[in-house]
Interface confidence: low
């Protein structure tokens, strides 16, 4: 039998063989072609299921096809989920979690925004009271309290009398910005720490003055008597 392949009956990319019985050419087609001579293009977009995954759009080409992928997918058949997190879009130590065609930033506490780029200003609600000065911190705030106040929000009026600063039986009165000592009779000073000098000016005419608490006594010189040795 003559070799039917001599006349090149098959498309150039096909493999030709000869039927040993009939002597006719057998064309084995490359992918994407059909027909007796493998010269007809297979429309991959029309036969059966869409070869493009994830709703990619199929475009027929000579001997093949192309997939035009939807947002978030890539690859010859749109089979690969694009990792939108590779560019590191999330800020402030947020975790980026890849989603179809987009990403989600899971923020660390204290941050917000699509990219966790916004430091939440916890001072916005004016949390510090009694004249405290608010300073914004990551996931919190701090209050610098004026004298006489304490607590995380300066909400506590410090009881300066708690340490019993007043001496000699004085009465301690708590004030917004400190305390006041109200001295018992015979004492003076901020803390009532000093005994009032009842010998000044010298009340004893002819004798030595002895200071007491809110009082004095006179030690008279020989020959003198009376409360003031007068």
């Amino acid at each position: 039998l003559d070799d039917a392949c001599v006349s090149n009956p098959c498309h150039e990319d096909a493999i030709c063989d000869t039927n040993p019985v009939s002597g006719r050419a057998i064309c084995t087609c490359p992918p994407g072609f059909t027909g007796g001579a493998c010269d007809q293009d297979v429309d991959e977009c029309s036969i059966g299921a869409n070869p493009c995954e994830h709703l990619g759009r199929c475009v027929n080409t000579q001997g093949s096809f192309l997939c035009q992928c939807g947002r978030g997918y890539t690859g010859p058949r749109c089979e690969t989920d694009v990792n939108e997190c590779l560019s590191g879009p999330c800020r402030n130590q947020a975790t980026c979690l890849d989603r179809i065609g987009q990403f989600t930033c899971i923020c660390m506490a204290g941050f917000t925004g699509t990219y966790c780029e916004v430091d939440i200003d916890e001072c916005q609600s004016s949390p510090c009271v009694n004249g405290g000065v608010c300073k914004d911190r990551v996931n919190g705030f701090s209050c610098t309290c004026p004298s006489g106040f304490s607590g995380s929000m300066c909400q506590l009026d410090v009881d300066e009398c708690a340490s019993t600063p007043c001496r000699n039986g004085a009465k301690c009165v708590d004030q917004p910005d400190g305390y006041e000592c109200r001295c018992a009779e015979g004492f003076e000073g901020t803390l009532c720490e000093r005994n009032v000098d009842d010998c000044s000016p010298d009340p004893c005419h002819h004798g030595r003055c002895v200071d007491g608490i809110a009082s004095f006594s006179c030690a008279c010189a020989p020959g003198y008597t009376g409360i003031r040795c007068e």
């Epitope: 997190c85 980026c96 899971i106």
Partner: antibody, heavy 115, light 108 residues
Framework: EVQLVESGGGLVQPGGSLRLSCAAS????????MSWVRQAPGKGLEWVSV????????YYADSVKGRFTISRDNSKNTLYLQMNSLRAEDTAVYYC????????WGQGTLVTVSS | DIVLTQSPATLSLSPGERATLSCRAS???????LAWYQQKPGQAPRLLIY???SRATGVPARFSGSGSGTDFTLTISSLEPEDFAVYYC?????????FGQGTKVEIK
């Protein structure tokens, strides 16, 4: 077919350890964040931990922090949960799930902590 | 932490009736990152809704999600026998990720 299959559950004494595994197939595992979620008998769902696709970031529920460790081997398409210092309250069905809103769940594996 | 409160705890309805499930957040859920799940006894949960209102693949159109900020709703327009189950909402806006305590939809 997208599939997650957990294994490694069982009975363990308080203070003991277990390592759960989750074999993934049918999707690009290395591009997906993965989570563990648990459900105590007769109770609701509780998020346990999450790991980013690259394994670079992990987060945990306060109830397991310092005791559980999530990890992954992208070359093996497998997610892990190492559970140490187990307590009775850790008794639950443990599910592995894809991403952070869970498009795919495993069938779950039961962990029982009891003396 | 964002606390999710679902109501009611139990909903007793007949097939064909409309079911309305509520999920309220203790603070605003950023970008409406809220999902709904259905769980039947002995089964893993199944994703129904993500992004507050987007139906997951293969979920029937009778399921719909709505809401934003702190108030979210799952509606089942006409209950089918297979819809009787427990439903959970979940936020994935901030760590820790949290779930609601669940709403059981039972046959009346």
């Amino acid at each position: 077919e997208v599939q997650l299959v957990e294994s490694g559950g069982g009975l363990v004494q308080p203070g003991g350890s277990l390592r759960l595994s989750c074999a993934a197939s049918g999707f690009t595992f290395s591009s997906s964040g993965m989570s563990w979620v648990r459900q105590a008998p007769g109770k609701g769902l509780e998020w346990v931990s999450v790991i980013a696709s690259s394994g670079s970031n992990t987060y945990y529920a306060d109830s397991v922090k310092g005791r559980f460790t999530i990890s992954r081997d992208n070359s093996k398409n497998t997610l892990y949960l190492q559970m140490n210092s187990l307590r009775a309250e850790d008794t639950a069905v443990y599910y592995c799930a894809r991403s952070i809103f869970y498009t795919t769940w495993g069938q779950g594996t039961l962990v029982t902590v009891s003396s | 932490d964002i606390v999710l409160t679902q109501s009611p705890a139990t909903l007793s309805l007949s097939p064909g009736e409309r079911a309305t499930l509520s999920c309220r957040a203790s603070q605003s859920v950023r970008s409406n990152y809220l999902a709904w799940y259905q769980q039947k006894p002995g089964q893993a949960p199944r994703l129904l809704i993500y992004g507050a209102s987007s139906r997951a693949t293969g979920v029937p159109a009778r399921f719909s999600g709505s809401g934003s900020g702190t108030d979210f709703t799952l509606t089942i327009s006409s209950l089918e026998p297979e819809d009787f189950a427990v439903y959970y909402c979940q936020q994935y806006s901030n760590f820790p990720i949290t779930f609601g305590q669940g709403t059981k939809v039972e046959i009346k």
